[in-house]
Amino acid sequence: AGVFELQIHSFGPGPGPGAPRSPCSARLPCRLFFRVCLKPGLSEEAAESPCALGAALSARGPVYTEQPGAPAPDLPLPDGLLQVPFRDAWPGTFSFIIETWREELGDQIGGPAWSLLARVAGRRRLAAGGPWARDIQRAGAWELRFSYRARCEPPAVGTACTRLCRPRSAPSRCGPGLRPCAPLEDECEAPLVCRAGCSPEHGFCEQPGECRCLEGWTGPLCTVPVSTSSCLSPRGPSSATTGCLVPGPGPCDGNPCANGGSCSETPRSFECTCPRGFYGLRCEVSGVTCADGPCFNGGLCVGGADPDSAYICHCPPGFQGSNCEKRVDRCSLQPCRNGGLCLDLGHALRCRCRAGFAGPRCEHDLDDCAGRACANGGTCVEGGGAHRCSCALGFGGRDCRERADPCAARPCAHGGRCYAHFSGLVCACAPGYMGARCEFPVHPDGASALPAAPPGLRPGDPQRYL
């Protein structure tokens, strides 16, 4: 287990012509924040794939307002490191995406608005416990300078954070074949099975099956004292055990090679053998080549055969950026109709429609009766944010396509029975009531509250509602 740490040093215009406009203005002050996404290995992965090693979000930076007429300076940054904890072993090779986000603080409806300013991506080799590695990445006209490192969390140690440290069992020293856990000198490495026969006093191992010698000792099992010939050019204090001067600090002590480079001594100084993707005297320069697969989203890498020559990503349609990590702004074609707000989500375009409009591109006008036929003789009524059909008798539903049950509302009063009829409904009234809906009582003397019934209809007969 351990933590990947990212320190942003600066974000601002890159060198060369075409300085970018400041992302903030007096009318629209803003502040920056950063997101880092880590993935293990150097595999070809799309920018949208999960951050399997972890991700982190920075705090918000100070509020920034552009000075009118001034070029965009390096923008104020959030305080502190971005830390991505990892639970398992550090993989040694990893891919990263660092995004610079802008939070606009103007009068936004519904709170602040966020937009992606820049995204850089790369693939690197890095040993845990090593020094900070510095990097510069460009995204369009912007330049991001940052450093990163991976460090182990106790009790883990080693370049992959796989070795463990344990509290000492004896007060003064560690057991055979073990050594103190720097920087936790009061702890010892947990036992590792070193090569058979490796001297428990003068040898140790970082990986199972190896035998590495303490200063002053040599040989495959660290049982041979360093030859007295090394006393001819002494570099350190006298050894009481051999009477010879033991070599003191050498040019490779502390490993001056960054980014997982291995150090070897030369007659005058030292030499770093750098892992692929790094070069320079101390492997401090990250020279990503096409072999590292720097192009996202199916981009084609050209050039960059060796670390000193730059690579170029030829991006497939729909992608852009130095690593094909950015999508083209499809919203510039204004696909949303009727004033809808366009959102390019990457995997899809979305339109946020104004009130009264609907559909994937806001193409349906909910208030509009034009071209919206109400079936079965219904008439369209506008208003209230939606169109509505006023249906003819016997029909219902949004478009008057459903046959209505005229008896559903129990229209017959005073216990009358309702019958559906092709032209509406018929009420069969209970004794003592009459009328289309059985709403009128029949007077005891036989007279009715209604005018005389039409010929052939007696009080109590079903009254047809026309």
């Epitope: 499809r330 074609l333 204004q334 949303c336 559909g359 994937p360 591109r361």
Partner: nanobody, 120 residues
Framework: QVQLVQSGGGLVQAGGSLRLSCAAS????????MGWYREAPGKQRELVAG???????KYAESVKGRFTFSRDNAKNTVYLQMNSLKPEDTGVYYC??????????????WGQGTQVTVKP
């Protein structure tokens, strides 16, 4: 699936003219928006001209008065007539279309790209 097939483009002297065409075919219910994007060396891809979802014709500031966008609805085809070409018009021109494949499903499609090179 919808296909966009581009034609036209090529090498021309500054001040010359070229015409690009882009034909959409496949399962098309209707075309919502369609246009041309340009990707110049070292620059981001940008809209050159096209018709929007609301049917308006839109041009980039840098091409107004020189380029003319037109469409043939019956053939599902758009054209870009480029006059008074300048070296800065050099780049790969991509046709793009926002297409309804049925009443409620819409997707974005890109053409294969056409190289336009304007020599000074």
């Amino acid at each position: 699936q919808v296909q966009l097939v581009q034609s036209g483009g090529g090498l021309v002297q500054a001040g010359g003219s070229l015409r690009l065409s882009c034909a959409a075919s496949g399962s098309i219910f209707s075309i919502n928006a369609m246009g041309w994007y340009r990707e110049a060396p070292g620059k981001q891809r940008e809209l050159v001209a096209g018709f929007t979802g609301d049917g308006m014709t839109k041009y980039a500031e840098s091409v107004k008065g020189r380029f003319t966008f037109s469409r043939d609805n019956a053939k599902n085809t758009v054209y870009l007539q480029m006059n008074s070409l300048k070296p800065e018009d050099t780049g790969v021109y991509y046709c793009a279309a926002d297409v309804f494949t049925d009443r409620d499903h819409v997707d974005w499609y890109w053409g294969q790209g056409t190289q336009v090179t304007v020599k000074p």
